[in-house]
């Protein structure tokens, strides 16, 4: 089964996923896709990254992250109830059937009608942009490497628990990810 | 025009091998998954393989992967199948087939089909 | 894998009718199914994808519903062109399964 995430509308959620590139810059293709993953790619692609850079996106769908190191987790901006649902993360690595792939499920809930200010769950400070710039491009799979045979599941459920950017590091430097070459 | 027209077919004894080709047109074909399936005579059809828009990822029909090889070459335009130690169950006719794309979509259904070449394995 | 079951395996109509034809998946495929026509001697060729949606140059008359394992192909009207045998296929898990096939027939 998925594991879960949630949201209030109107809050940017989080979905993580990383994997720990080979090299600097040996980048792995990655897409993102509402609803749970199908055989090849992701059905219904919000966002697709290639060997270099982010070549297809969809608006309110971004990654946070520096992507260029591995962390291609989502952020969804400003989220509404139907914004709810499974989406796929697949990180594309090259040889025969080698994807991994990573079904996560996005709850959302009604905001609170409340007077007292609450700590909003929003990523945007923990994980500040680092793309400047994204540009269309054919959806190519092209990327070195190889997958030892690592079960990474728990992954969502460690990175479910990311407040802030240490965290995030934490994590990442806990071998918690999918690690190429 | 999209075209998808597939050679190499033939007869050829058990343990034998052959090389199927896959000739596309009418559309930029590195920017396509791409797909064998296969029907028995009389029977359905079987996907056998698909392979990525630069051949650099592979997906096989388990029973088959240690006899069967998926590739393509883009500078040609072409998709290839090259099949050993063939048995008489891969008599079938052999599709070559183009996976639908356009952005915000995934490549798991078919939307170009060639004719098929027939393989028929037998002593 | 993923079964794929389809029923009936053979069906006799007339022009006019309207036809429907099932397709049961072993386990949850969501909204991951295909539709495919194909006549004798000839490929097959893409109906319906994603359960519901109509494959560009595909007449009204055809329509797909149902989510999870449960699905239907449906002719609102035959035409004599539409007797041929159909296909459902799976694109959630590896392999791509297709169903055995249903041969529509005039009676």
């Known amino acids: 089964s998925e594991v879960e995430y949630r949201a209030e509308v109107g809050q940017n959620a989080y979905l993580p996923c990383f994997y720990t590139p080979a090299a600097p810059g040996n980048l792995v293709p990655v897409c993102w896709g509402k609803g749970a993953c199908p055989v090849f790619e992701c059905g219904n692609v919000v966002l697709r990254t290639d060997e270099r850079d982010v070549n297809y996106w969809t608006s309110r769908y971004w990654l946070n992250g520096d992507f260029r190191k591995g962390d291609v987790s989502l952020t969804i901006e400003n989220v509404t109830l139907a914004d709810s649902g499974i989406y796929c993360c697949r990180i594309q690595i090259p040889g025969i059937m080698n994807d991994e792939k990573f079904n996560l499920k996005l709850v959302i809930k009604p905001a609170k009608v409340t007077p007292a200010p609450t700590r909003q769950r929003d990523f945007t400070a923990a994980f500040p942009r680092m793309l400047t710039t994204r540009g269309h491009g054919p959806a190519e799979t092209q990327t070195l490497g190889s997958l030892p045979d690592i079960n990474l599941t728990q992954i969502s459920t460690l990175a479910n628990e990311l407040r802030d950017s240490r965290l995030a590091n934490d994590l990442r430097d806990s071998g918690a990810t999918i690690r190429i070459g | 025009e999209v075209q998808l027209v597939e050679s190499g077919g033939g007869l050829v004894k058990p343990g034998g091998s052959l090389r199927l080709s896959c000739a596309a047109s009418g559309f930029t074909f590195s920017d396509y998954y791409m797909t064998w399936v296969r029907q028995a005579p009389g029977k359905g059809l079987e996907w056998v393989a698909s392979?990525?828009?630069?051949?650099?990822?592979?997906y096989y029909l388990d029973s088959l992967k240690s006899r069967f090889t998926i590739s393509r070459d883009n500078a040609k335009n072409s998709l290839y199948l090259q099949m050993n130690s063939l048995r008489a169950e891969d008599t079938a006719v052999y599709y070559c087939?183009?996976?639908?794309?356009?952005?915000?979509?995934?490549?798991?259904?078919?939307?170009?089909w060639g004719q098929g070449t027939l393989v028929t394995v037998s002593s | 894998d993923i079964q794929m079951t389809q029923s009936p395996s053979s069906l006799s109509a007339s022009v006019g009718d309207r036809v429907t034809i099932t397709c049961r998946a072993s386990e949850n495929i969501y909204s991951y199914l295909t539709w495919y026509q194909q006549k004798p001697g000839k490929a097959p060729k893409l109906l319906i994808y994603?359960?519901?949606t109509l494959a560009e140059g595909v007449p009204s008359r055809f329509s797909g519903s149902g989510s999870g394992t449960d699905f239907t192909l449906t002719i609102s009207s035959l035409q004599p062109e539409d007797f041929a045998t159909y296909y459902c296929?799976?694109?959630?898990?590896?392999?791509?399964?297709f169903g055995q096939g249903t041969k529509l027939e005039i009676k």
């Open positions: 087939a183009r996976g639908y794309y356009y952005y915000g979509s995934s490549p798991n259904y078919f939307d170009y």
């Open positions: 994603n359960a519901k």
């Open positions: 296929q799976q694109h959630y898990g590896t392999p791509l399964t």
């Open positions: 392979i990525n828009y630069d051949g650099r990822n592979t």
